[in-house]
Amino acid sequence: SSSPTSSASSFSSSAPFLASAVSAQPPLPDQCPALCECSEAARTVKCVNRNLTEVPTDLPAYVRNLFLTGNQLAVLPAGAFARRPPLAELAALNLSGSRLDEVRAGAFEHLPSLRQLDLSHNPLADLSPFAFSGSNASVSAPSPLVELILNHIVPPEDERQNRSFEGMVVAALLAGRALQGLRRLELASNHFLYLPRDVLAQLPSLRHLDLSNNSLVSLTYVSFRNLTHLESLHLEDNALKVLHNGTLAELQGLPHIRVFLDNNPWVCDCHMADMVTWLKETEVVQGKDRLTCAYPEKMRNRVLLELNSADLDCDPILPPSLQTS
């Protein structure tokens, strides 16, 4: 995932004696937290691969790009980045690979300029519905986030709560309608089996949606109709068998869309006829000439664009009286 890029400015490492004893006071303008590297010129702080167990309290007020990757944060509490004075210019926050398993309500409150958040590669067993909205109001203040990167946040099977992981993530995305301004959402590699039907309708500003490398079997109940601005939809490496007419028509109706469908186990039987016809005509599918059948066995590796209706048959279903037990 793309993260806040740093410029080539020199970084100053903090001196080891700058302990967190002064953390309750406003940080000095040039102070750099222990175990971090700071560049005031680039407005960047990097606390990377330091096994930190909590967010440093003495972050410099100038920070715009904050890397807290490769740590052991475990829990992100409410107001984890709330400071006095606030981190008013923090725009890009990368927390990827920091062993976070819980993000609590209001974890990102008091970050008025936060545009990009990357929580990828954390086993988020407990993502509060109010992690991004900050409050449990039915309509929250709009979040400043425009890019939210949540790739590979699924916890191991044995660490999951007794609830749908998809539902937990979607609840956080929809709470308080705070993410109405979200333009880029990455949800790749999360073992999603389905997409709750209401999620996309409530993210009307989306331009880029990455659902690649999940386990989506069908899009039948997903509506793309409201996503009139959507520019790219990544569905590569899922478990899609066929796209039905309703989905095809909705995708075709999106004026700017590019759809990526590579590496899905397409089932080339009679139900595939509409999709094949659509593929031959549409320009929205990128790399459509690479799409191949996975099933039935006799059709394996056949190119979808080269199929005709005669190739797409369904084995007749025997009437009940002729079926053997």
Partner: antibody
Framework: QVQLQQSDAELVRPGASVKMSCKVS????????IHWMKQRPEQGLEWIGY????????TYNEKFKGKATLTADKSSSTAYMQLNSLTSEDSAVYFC?????????????WGTGTTVTVSS | DIQMTQSPASLSASVGETVTITCRAS??????LAWYQQKQGKSPQLLVY???TLAEGVPSRFSGSYSGTQFSLNINSLQSEDFGIYYC?????????FGAGTKLDLK
Amino acid sequence: QVQLQQSDAELVRPGASVKMSCKVSGYTFTDHTIHWMKQRPEQGLEWIGYIYPRDGSGTYNEKFKGKATLTADKSSSTAYMQLNSLTSEDSAVYFCARDGSSHYWYFDVWGTGTTVTVSS
Amino acid sequence: DIQMTQSPASLSASVGETVTITCRASEIIYNYLAWYQQKQGKSPQLLVYNAKTLAEGVPSRFSGSYSGTQFSLNINSLQSEDFGIYYCQHHHDTPLTFGAGTKLDLK
């Protein structure tokens, strides 16, 4: 440092097409959207559209649909804009510019500009 | 489309003076506004984004502020290198649009 180097000035005939380039250096090309702007002499700036080099997606200002085509080549870290069916109204300086991220939509680094003159 | 109305169209000032340029959006754009400076024959340069955040390397004599749909760029103690054309641009939704520009020249 981050740089966007645009191709040289073009003198073209009415009705012809032109393809200009914007070669970037100093950062990862696929992390930032590239936008294109038009500026006519003594006039303001108009946004043409953008392309996200990571997957080639993007969008156009309705006014420039059919006039401009944006592409990107990841292997050479170069964005391109083709303008077709040129008229005198297309005589302008064209700038590429880097988005602050992928979808921030402000422009933190601008290219050097390519002057297009349409004349018979 | 969101219209950006910039004023004044031109402005004369002396070195050391303070000047303010304003921009009004035709609808709510929150703090999604940027300011650029362009000198004759050069490319524009980003000064401010998110209405108030100074871009990297921009001197602190520049500042941005806003209230509702009205945005301002303030330049304290003008320097000789500050003369040129200033543009506002909203970054709230597409199509992205610019103000018509304010030409700041030496009195």
